[in-house]
């Protein structure tokens, strides 16, 4: 297969960093990280015709080049520029779904509503979803023992900078009506410190984006409150309005029914509020 050819051509040994080296507070690089990234790339480009011409070996070279031999607390967006370029992807800009603290439901939704896209439905998001990685300054080794934690060690680590960079580009590419799914069960439904609150909100382009529509997902079956009146949602509305983007909000009282109605919109029970 194509994947075997790639690894044959490389013949790279990914040594673990010896245990006596720098210990970070976070988990180490995901096992079989290079193989996983390459396998995901091959799979994605086979399934998505618009990305079929992408060379997964070049994608891996660009990914590797962003963090290998670099101090894992000194990574910049510029380090990821080659990967971002190779992963440039034209998704329908009016079909973008952002999410915050409710990834699983957002992904379940786009699996059903196939014409909408989360970041993880794009090549770059798909490659890195749920993975951890870091290297070590001046060696070509991947650190499988530990990687920097955003809070305890440093924010400019390979994983955090990747998601900041790719999230910014994803938001910049959005147009018309942009949707965001928010978790109504959390104390801060909108959190200014989340990737959505700190990156995506500020990179929506007012000249392209007309409206941000928030979907607040309720957790409890009996929860009939209007969470669109929550102070943090009002804060989001204020930030968005100041950026000359309109804001709207909807309560999704029953996420299970919501998904069911996305699957079967003709169902008679789907005309009532969900």
């Amino acid at each position: 297969s194509g994947l075997n050819d790639i690894f044959e051509a490389q013949k790279i040994e990914w040594h673990e960093v010896p245990r006596w080296r720098q210990q970070w507070s976070g988990p180490g690089t995901t096992k079989r990280f290079p193989e996983t990234v390459l396998a995901r790339c091959v799979k994605y480009t086979e399934i998505h015709p618009e990305m079929r011409h992408v060379d997964c070996q070049s994608v891996w070279d660009a990914f590797k080049g962003a963090f290998i031999s670099k101090h894992p607390c000194n990574i910049t967006e510029e380090d990821y520029q080659p990967l971002m370029k190779l992963g440039t992807q034209t998704v329908p800009c009016n079909k973008i779904l952002l999410w915050s603290r409710i990834k699983d439901l957002a992904h379940q939704f786009t699996q059903v509503q196939r014409d909408m896209f989360t970041l993880e439905d794009t090549l770059l998001g798909y490659l890195a979803d749920d993975l951890t990685w870091c290297g070590e300054f001046n060696t070509s080794k991947i650190n499988y023992q530990s990687c920097p934690d955003w809070r305890k060690d440093c924010s400019n680590n390979p994983v955090s900078v990747f998601w900041k960079t790719v999230s910014r580009r994803f938001a910049e590419a959005a147009c018309d009506v942009v949707h965001v799914m928010l978790n109504g069960s959390r104390s801060k439904i909108f959190d200014k410190n989340s990737t959505f609150g700190s990156v995506e909100v500020h990179n929506l382009q007012p000249e392209k984006v007309q409206t941000l529509e928030a979907w607040v997902i309720h957790g409890g079956r009996e929860d009939s409150r209007d969470l669109c009146q929550d102070p943090t949602i009002k804060e989001l509305e204020s930030i968005i309005s100041k950026r000359n983007i309109q804001f709207s909000c909807k309560n999704i009282y029953r996420p299970d029914k919501f998904l069911q109605c996305v699957k079967n919109p003709e169902d008679s029970s789907c005309t009532s509020e969900i």
């Epitope: 618009e50 990305m51 011409h53 992408v54 070049s58 070279d61 660009a62 590797k64 080049g65 290998i68 031999s69 967006e77 510029e78 380090d79 520029q81 080659p82 971002m84 370029k85 190779l86 992963g87 440039t88 992807q89 034209t90 329908p92 800009c93 910014r168 580009r169 910049e172 590419a173 147009c175 392209k208």
Partner: antibody, heavy 121, light 110 residues
């Protein structure tokens, strides 16, 4: 001043090979994508290949160029090369190298171009 | 393959005329607006005029303007000057970092 200077063009037989050079000056070579673009006589522009090498070469190609054309870089000489093999009559063109604008807001556009070198097959 | 179609292929104009060139892409460009326009004079390399559909490149006169999004774009010269008689190319940026150019529009003196 940013300068790109192509060389190596000339007359070559069908099936032959040629290596073009693009010498760069006036900017930090490693921090930019260098793109090869060609223009057949009296025709439009067509991109060929791209290379970037802050740490190790990252390169990619137009679909039609894969296999026959190879882009490479010598950082010590501030030069990018385009190796062209199995040349055909339809490869006859002026070959330009261009520097892409820097920064993600400008990526995808070519701000600086060489004067071009003519390849005749 | 992505096709960028420019129209017209040739355009005759007099100094002071308003000129509009159209560029249509067979696929949406990246970010809905990742399209550039270049001007090329005989024997010379192209020169960047506009990027991201509507942004003027450095040093380009304000009589040039661009608009459009997705798959349809236009370049307008509000009042053609003698220096503007040249060939104009649109260029889109697409998935995987690939590029495509339009076939060109030659603006000639009427």
């Amino acid at each position: 001043e940013v300068q790109l200077l192509e060389s190596g063009g000339g007359l070559v037989q069908p099936g032959g090979s040629l290596r073009l050079s693009c010498a760069a000056s006036g900017f930090s070579f490693n921090n930019y994508w260098i793109i090869w673009i060609r223009q057949a006589p009296g025709k439009g522009l067509e991109w060929v290949a791209a290379i970037y090498s802050p740490s190790g070469d990252i390169k990619y190609y137009a679909d039609w160029a894969k296999g026959r054309f190879t882009v490479s870089k010598d950082n010590s000489k501030n030069t990018v090369y385009l190796q062209m093999n199995s040349l055909r009559a339809e490869d006859t063109a002026v070959y330009y190298c261009a520097r892409e604008l820097s920064g993600s807001a400008y990526e995808g556009y070519f701000e600086s171009w060489g004067q071009g070198t003519l390849v005749t097959v | 393959d992505i096709q960028l179609t420019q129209s017209p292929s040739t355009l005759s104009a007099s100094v002071g005329d308003r000129v509009t060139i159209t560029c249509r892409s067979s696929q949406s460009v990246y970010g809905h607006n990742w399209l550039a326009w270049y001007q090329q004079k005989p024997g010379k390399a192209p020169k960047l005029l506009m990027y991201r559909a509507s942004n003027l490149a450095s040093g380009v006169p304000s009589r040039f303007s661009g608009s459009g999004s997705g798959t349809e774009f236009t370049l307008t010269i509000s009042s053609v000057q003698p220096d503007d008689f040249a060939t104009y190319y649109c260029q889109g940026y697409y998935s995987g970092g690939s590029y495509a150019f339009g076939g060109g529009t030659k603006v000639e003196i009427k």
